[in-house]
Amino acid sequence: PKQTLPKPIIRAESTYMVPKEKQATLCCQGSYGAVEYQLHFEGSLFAVERPKPPERINGVKFHIPDMNSRKAGRYSCIYRVGELWSERSDLLDLVVTEMYDTPTLSVHPGPEVTSGEKVTFYCRLDTATSMFLLLKEGRSRDVQRSYGKVQAEFPMGPVTTAHRGSYRCFGSYNNYAWSFPSEPVKLLVTGDIENTSLAPTDPTFPDSWDTCLLTRETGLQKDLALWDHTAQN
């Protein structure tokens, strides 16, 4: 039978959108007993980390200093136990922000609407970009894209209280290099009386799931247990 190790999970600590010149931190969560973790960028080896002691830690953090457009792109990680390597993690898109200019975000008919009304966001940026992105704070994985020379529109259709929250937009110079964020626009949706006061507020940036859930084993676990779970040929 085939020897396999669980595929690692790659995450960005706090957010995958990193302002230029700031430090990005990526976490690779593998297994206790893993000897070495490798971070790959666009398919090539980028960094290596070794947890110390390996049998007590289930992952590592990779710090990427001085974020810029050359470091923005697709990252993945792998790890090994003994000389056996895991499969590659899923890909993580790391974006550099605060490039060049700041767009302006507006909403029509206005920031205060009634449930069922049609709402459209407009993102405007005068410098050369053709792609615009709209993000709801706390939901930054759900990026809406739209295209336009100077301005893009984001029709939301009939809104509900679920659309309430703060929105920002970005101009994108390529998939991984974004402008400064616009000033936030807070959309207030009234109606659906039973939900109005009880609807949970969205978490603000950073995203609640963009955290590194690495743990250090403190109990008396069998030393290097993982060596044995993959021992067959």
Epitope: K2, Q3, T4, L5, V35, E36, L45, R50, K52, P53, P54, E55, V81, G82, E83, L84, W85, R88, D223, L224, L226, W227, T230, A231, N233
Partner: antibody, heavy 117, light 107 residues
Framework: QVQLVQSGAEVKKPGASVKVSCKAS????????MHWVRQAPGQGLEWIGY????????EYNQKFKDRTTITADKSTSTAYMELSSLRSEDTAVYYC??????????WGQGTLVTVSS | DIQMTQSPSSLSASVGDRVTITCRAS??????LAWFQQKPGKAPKLLVY???NLADGVPSRFSGSGSGTDYTLTISSLQPEDFATYYC?????????FGGGTKVEIK
């Protein structure tokens, strides 16, 4: 059962290249790394590098990096180690070794490469 | 690079003797150490992995111990087939390196 069968002995002149093959059987070739280790006559063991046949990713001992190429052919479950610009001190037995969660668990029978003018 | 210093380089012993071979790493290798046995004209054979775990089919008279930088291979009662050369090897980083070897000879 797991078997690593290497190509036969080679005699080469200084400056030439040699390519040693290692055919794997008895396991899933792409699930394990393949390492290369050499041993000069009467000497100890020296790690050259490895390949992950699944991805083609290679890592080398810095000492050999400029002269060594490790490749793998998934269709034939065969790994190769090519060493160029041969010198007399490259005379050694070259082993392919399977890398598993337990380390270097299966070794080929070895290939003697003699470099002599 | 991590250096692996093995001692002694050779030893003479009799059948039934207890034999101890040591290996010191130049830095902490966190138990990422293996021991191999090699007989003349043959490929090395894995004896111990992860410092303390016996490989399949290895007699229980062999044992590995140690942590950090210092590791030991012990043969509790030497048998005729144990006369060979023994190597330690780390796999904590790149390059993987081996100790210089210990030749166990018949007294």
């Amino acid at each position: 059962q797991v078997q690593l069968v290497q190509s036969g002995a080679e005699v080469k002149k200084p400056g030439a290249s040699v390519k040693v093959s290692c055919k794997a059987s008895g396991y899933t070739f792409t699930s394990f790394t393949m390492h290369w280790v050499r041993q000069a006559p009467g000497q100890g063991l020296e790690w050259i590098g490895y390949i992950n046949p699944s991805s083609g990713y290679t890592e080398y001992n810095q000492k050999f990096k400029d002269r060594t190429t490790i490749t793998a052919d998934k269709s034939t479950s065969t790994a190769y180690m090519e060493l160029s610009s041969l010198r007399s001190e490259d005379t050694a037995v070259y082993y392919c070794v399977r890398g598993s969660s337990r380390g270097f668990d299966y070794w080929g029978q070895g290939t003697l490469v003699t470099v002599s003018s | 690079d991590i250096q692996m210093t093995q001692s002694p380089s050779s030893l003479s012993a009799s059948v039934g003797d207890r034999v101890t071979i040591t290996c010191r790493a130049s830095e902490n290798i966190y138990s990422n150490l293996a021991w191999f046995q090699q007989k003349p004209g043959k490929a090395p054979k894995l004896l111990v992995y992860a410092a303390t775990n016996l490989a399949d089919g290895v007699p229980s008279r062999f044992s590995g111990s140690g942590s950090g930088t210092d590791y030991t291979l012990t043969i509790s009662s030497l048998q005729p087939e144990d006369f060979a050369t023994y190597y330690c090897q780390h796999f904590w980083g790149t390059p993987r390196t081996f100790g210089g070897g210990t030749k166990v000879e018949i007294k």
